[in-house]
Interface confidence: medium
């Protein structure tokens, strides 16, 4: 049988044979810098201790240094993400050395077994980056390393064991199973390097969670709430291979972090901002678009360095494909209710109309449930720049499109026969751009004509900058 | 739906080799790792080794390492195991089965292949 | 190697009965513990894996629990359909190794 190391293995480990690795000349870790853009070229292969060789590669001991770590594999390749993510740094930055660590052989392992082999990789890249600081104009400030799942732990790893401190570290939804709950030495955290920044794509509450689900850095980032991305739905991948299986949507789920970081890297006129909240409920009912006190960041390598006390958890919206950024908005609608209508739970629509485009029709999602008589909170998003918001539609769906709806409706008409006409007033929407923070008032055309009904819509038209009116002593409950 | 078919019962005599197959259908058949377990009569099952057809990756038990050799035709989806010299020790059901990744799990079985070694 | 040992080789029960079946590891093997269902045909099925997740399929009446060396599988409601024998099986590293069953029979 094959041994094992266990993750909180001692240091010793080091002289061990790592898991299930063949007795082969191929060495277990290399440090591979890509020199050239064609992701054909092998690179060249540094080699601890070997300073002529570093020369000779071409590393530039002045500049910004990436080292690129793989996660586990079952092809025993590296697979096309990597090639990606190696040509989008070196597009932008021209004079960085951009180096993948290639440990093939300890991660085309059981999963198990390549978990048990991150720590002794994670060391093999801790006495690199000590062999590299040895070299006088080299600065571990300027090195980032950027781990994708079981890689992101290894970084973790590497920075916990290095002389010093690593600039930054980018975990890429880094791997959950065997890490989730971990020790903070035994996983991913922030006390590996100066910035943890981490993306969460796969986070499951059910089934296993692939990518860990916990907040590992400084701050981390779950696009989409972190779990079902757009473009990954089973209808989505079944259409470009032969048999569309769970494999797919969690390999492209799990990916996503990848190319979202690549993404900030290519399209960096179009970057994407999340915003801090407590959790994805929150932030789906449109309450936490805040950019106050460091409350919303680029994501990706854009992110801004935030080094808070408590870690901070923080959420966007995403599109299915590159360039991914899409239009947050928060919409406060105050409800007002003069029948009694019961409880009722309208389906409500909004479309926008901007200076440079106007928005689909957009659904109103309800996390609960509409208050009356009460500002209700909500979060569209668009995926084109609408510029200026002008006008919104709102309506109110009519005809129900499924037997549910028209139980509610059957349901909702027995319990008050008497008052079909249901009907609410709504007067004003209020309106916050999360990307430029801009706030607007929205008020109906007709300041007679307040109400809407189901099959009916409302219009409205900025009238308003910002969010106070007339009569108003004090502002709506402000954003947290 | 997922699917693993094997091959049907084998009488063999002492000493000679058997080759048992296993075709999948139903899913990406490069993208996952076939295993196969042995279940003597009325007694439990024994992990003897994985194929994976991606790679042509396979992993023995050390136990069954001069036993079994694990092979693969891609373009019939199909993965064979050969047992070699033969006892009465190595009549058994021989299962077939899908490996899940992540989980380590065996989510997809096929119906077992009985092999009877008897001289 | 790591030994899997589920003590109780053969249990009787009632229809309906709450029903635990217990799967003991030579060593902790981190939740990859996955359970399955073989029917008196031979047919082998998957029910729970990584402790305490239910297959794609299986009743919601199993479910399973442990960490660390102790893992159970209980079925809270016994039907019929499940008078089979039960192994357990750790995935935490090669070589895999199964529990010897455990026989469930009706009183």
């Known amino acids: 049988s094959i041994t094992t190391l266990r993750p909180q293995g001692s240091l010793r480990d080091e002289h061990h044979k790592p898991t299930g690795v063949p007795a082969t000349a191929r060495p277990s870790v290399a440090f591979n810098i890509r020199t050239s853009k064609d992701p054909e070229q092998e690179g060249c292969n540094l080699s601890l201790g070997d300073s002529k060789l570093l020369e000779n590669c071409g590393f530039n001991m002045t500049a910004k240094t990436f080292f690129i770590i793989h996660g586990w594999t079952m092809s025993g390749m590296f697979e096309s993400w990597l090639h990606k993510l190696v040509s989008a740094l070196q597009m932008r930055e021209k004079d960085a050395n951009v180096v993948v660590v290639d440990w093939l052989p300890l991660a085309h392992q059981l999963y198990t077994d390549a978990v048990n082999n991150t720590r002794v990789v994670g060391q093999r890249v801790a006495g690199m980056l000590d062999w590299l600081q040895e070299k006088e104009e080299f600065s571990l400030g300027n090195v980032h390393l950027i781990g994708y799942s079981l890689g992101a732990h290894v970084a973790g790893y590497a920075g916990n064991f290095v002389k010093g401190t690593v600039g930054r570290i980018t975990g890429l939804d880094p791997a959950g199973p065997m890490f989730e709950g971990a020790d903070i030495h035994k996983r991913l955290s922030p006390d590996d390097a100066d910035f943890v920044d981490v993306l969460h794509t796969y986070t499951r509450s059910f089934g296993l969670s692939i990518g860990i689900q916990m907040p590992v850095g400084h701050i981390d980032i779950y696009p989409n709430g972190g779990d079902f991305q757009p473009g990954c739905g089973l209808n989505d991948v079944l259409g470009s291979i032969a048999y569309g299986t769970i494999t797919e949507v969690v390999k492209c789920e799990h990916e996503r972090a990848v190319h979202l970081f690549v993404d900030s890297l290519v399209n960096q006129d179009k970057p994407s901002f999340a915003f801090q909240c407590t959790d994805s409920n929150r932030f789906k009912k449109g309450i936490c678009l805040s950019c106050r006190k460091n409350r919303c960041n680029s994501i990706g390598y854009n992110a801004k360095k935030m080094r808070n006390k408590r870690n901070s958890k923080m959420y966007l919206k995403t599109r299915a494909g590159m360039p991914f950024r899409v239009y947050h908005y928060q919409m406060k609608i105050h409800v007002f209710s003069y029948k009694n209508m019961g409880e009722i739970e309208p389906t409500f629509y909004v479309t926008l109309y901007g200076t440079n485009a106007d928005s689909q029709t957009l659904p109103l999602e309800i996390v609960e449930r509409i208050e009356q008589n009460a500002t209700n909170t909500f979060l569209v998003y668009t995926e084109e720049d609408l510029g200026d918001l002008l006008k919104i539609q709102l309506t109110w769906e009519g005809a129900s499109q499924s037997w549910y709806n028209l139980w509610k409706e059957f349901r909702s008409y027995l319990s008050q026969p008497r008052n079909p006409g249901r009907e609410l007033n709504i007067r004003r929407i209020r309106v916050k751009s999360g990307e430029t923070q801009r706030k607007l008032t929205f008020c109906t055309e007709d300041p007679e004509n307040t109400s809407i009904s189901p099959g009916r819509e409302l219009w409205f038209r900025k009238c308003r900058d910002g969010w106070r009116m007339k009569n108003e002593t004090s502002p709506t409950v402000e954003l947290p | 739906q997922v699917q693993l078919q094997q091959s049907g019962a084998e009488l063999v005599k002492p000493g000679a080799s058997v080759r048992l197959s296993c075709k999948a259908s139903?899913?990406?058949?490069?993208?996952?790792?076939i295993h196969w377990v042995k279940q003597r009569s009325g007694q439990g099952l024994e992990w003897i080794g994985w194929?994976?057809?991606?790679?042509?990756?396979?992993k023995y038990n050390e136990k069954f390492k001069d036993k079994a050799t694990l092979t693969a035709d891609k373009s019939s989806r199909t993965v064979y195991m050969e047992l070699s010299r033969l006892t009465s020790e190595d009549s058994a059901v021989y299962f077939c089965?899908?490996?899940?990744?992540?989980?380590?799990?065996?989510?997809?079985w096929g119906q077992g292949t009985l092999v009877t070694v008897s001289a | 190697d790591i030994q899997m040992t589920q003590t109780t080789s053969s249990l009787s029960a009632s229809l309906g009965d709450r029903v635990t079946i217990s799967c003991r590891a030579s060593?902790?093997?981190?939740?990859?513990l996955n359970w399955y269902q073989q029917q008196p045909d031979g047919t082998v099925k998957l029910l729970i894996y990584?402790?305490?997740r239910l297959h794609s399929g299986v009743p919601s009446r199993f479910s399973g629990s442990g960490s660390g060396t102790d893992y159970s599988l209980t079925i809270s409601n016994l039907e019929q359909e499940d008078i089979a024998t039960y192994f357990c099986?750790?995935?935490?590293?090669?070589?895999?190794?199964f529990g010897g069953g455990t026989n469930l029979e009706i009183k």
């Open positions: 060593q902790d093997i981190s939740n990859y």
């Open positions: 089965a899908r490996h899940e990744e992540y989980t380590n799990s065996l989510a997809y």
């Open positions: 099986q750790q995935g935490y590293t090669l070589p895999w190794t």
């Open positions: 139903g899913y990406t058949f490069t993208k996952y790792t």
């Open positions: 990584y402790t305490s």
């Open positions: 194929f994976y057809p991606g790679s042509d990756s396979i």
